[in-house]
């Protein structure tokens, strides 16, 4: 008797965060030998069977969750962890602050404000270098994103985006990039 | 216009076996995933069998795998069911489907049913 | 036993506005698969209803309509007419074997 199948993983190459019309390729990785891949779309009942799906041009109704599953025999994996696929640059930017200054003290406090003239409900932060959203528990984003205590490793280059919870796939293009300098 | 229509339904003992066939027209038939869905009489709609478009990719219901084996013949435009060790819970009509399908995307449903086949598994 | 549960019949008089409810699971529904419906007329095929929750195929009118939250979802209709006599079936897809799976179906009936 053989063990469960493991899990496949799913990536978007280069980035999970895509600017409209630009090119991305999802690739769904099991073990050797699988008989079949299949890749969802979630809340949208679409499926292809093919590992890798290539899209020459993103579009806003490409944005959304994603998920895939192999088949070996008759068994099928359990699904991998889901990818969301956002789709960037569908709204304006928004502008990226430092309070009191981007230049600070080893040791001082800081807060980055991501603002937007627009009525958006929801802001992701991204260090330039790191794969996720800064400070992200559970998807939770705000405005302002306080960093206590400052060390040299919060030195670098730091954009936002903002979103509307009701469609959290479509995002607007990156603020303009703001440099930390810890001194 | 679109059209499916299934035929070799009929009486059969059970421990028999019985071929099912689905005819298309009207669409680039090889392009689309298609089901065999089944209704025991006064019952609701059972999934059986579906089978993508090159025939490649197929999965079954547990009540009938390692019975039944679904293929297609898509130079025939043709789908099929072969049903052996037959049961007399098999009894329904069975009607093929299709899944409707977009660009590369297939979905989740079905867009047009053939009008079913009755087989009818009785001593 | 059905994977996805609906109540096995409703009832309305001419006019009036029905509901069919159809609960599903945290593997189908739940994991995020869209529900659609299919009405079933006396002696026929079924036919698709709705696709994608609420989305209504051509031809159909305007007076059925879906929608789906969570694990669950319904069907709607709106203005009850003798035609809209039929068994009416939900439908997903179940994220453990990869299958299609039914409810169980409604009998629709209208009164007088």
């Known amino acids: 008797q053989r063990g469960p199948l493991p899990k496949p993983s799913l990536q978007a190459l280069p980035s999970s965060l895509v600017p409209l019309e630009k090119p991305v390729t999802l690739r769904c990785q099991g073990p050797p030998g699988v008989d079949l891949y299949r890749l969802e779309k979630l809340s949208s009942s679409r499926y292809q069977d093919q590992a890798v799906l290539f899209i020459p041009a993103m579009k806003r109704h490409l944005a959304g969750r994603y998920r895939c599953s192999y088949q070996n025999g008759s068994l099928w994996s359990p699904p991998s962890d889901q990818l969301e696929l956002v789709a960037t640059g569908v709204f304006a930017k928004p502008s990226l602050s430092a309070q009191p200054g981007p230049a600070v003290s080893s040791g001082g406090d800081v807060t980055l404000q991501c603002q937007t003239r627009y009525g958006f409900d929801q802001f992701a932060l991204y260090k330039e270098g790191d794969p996720a959203p800064y400070k992200n528990p559970e998807r939770w984003y705000r405005a302002s994103f306080p960093i206590i205590t400052v060390t040299a490793a919060h030195s670098g280059t730091y954009r936002c985006y903002s979103f509307s919870s009701g469609d959290p796939y479509l995002w607007s293009a990156p603020s303009d990039p703001l440099e930390l300098m810890v001194t | 216009q679109v059209q499916l229509v299934e035929s070799g339904g009929g009486l059969v003992k059970p421990g028999g076996s019985l071929r099912l066939s689905c005819a298309a027209s009207?669409?680039?038939?090889?392009?689309?995933?298609v089901s065999w869905i089944r209704q025991a009489p006064g019952k609701g709609l059972e999934w059986v069998s579906a089978?993508?478009?090159?025939?490649?990719?197929?999965q079954y219901a547990e009540s009938v795998k390692g019975r039944f084996t679904i293929s297609r013949d898509n130079a025939k435009n043709s789908l099929y069911l072969q049903m052996n060790s037959l049961r007399a819970e098999d009894t329904a009509v069975y009607y093929c489907?299709?899944?409707?399908?977009?660009?590369?995307?297939?979905?989740?449903?079905?867009?047009?049913w053939g009008q079913g086949t009755l087989v009818t598994v009785s001593s | 036993q059905s994977v996805l549960t609906q109540p096995p019949s409703v009832s309305g008089a001419p006019g009036q506005r029905v509901t069919i409810s159809c609960t599903g699971s945290?593997?189908?529904?739940?994991?995020?698969?869209?529900v659609h419906w299919y009405q079933q007329l006396p002696g026929t095929a079924p036919k698709l209803l709705i696709y994608?929750?609420?989305n209504r195929p051509s031809g159909v009118p305007d007076r059925f309509s879906g929608s789906k939250s969570g694990t669950s979802a319904s069907l709607a209709i709106t203005g009850l007419q003798a035609e809209d006599e039929a068994d009416y079936y939900c439908?997903?897809?179940?994220?453990?074997?990869?299958?299609?799976?039914f409810g169980g179906g409604t009998k629709l009936t209208v009164l007088g």
């Open positions: 489907a299709r899944h409707y399908r977009e660009f590369r995307w297939h979905y989740y449903y079905f867009d047009y």
């Open positions: 009207g669409f680039s038939f090889g392009d689309y995933y």
């Open positions: 089978i993508g478009g090159s025939g490649s990719a197929v």
């Open positions: 945290s593997s189908n529904i739940g994991a995020g698969y869209d």
């Open positions: 994608g929750n609420s």
């Open positions: 439908q997903s897809h179940d994220l453990g074997a990869h299958v299609w799976v």
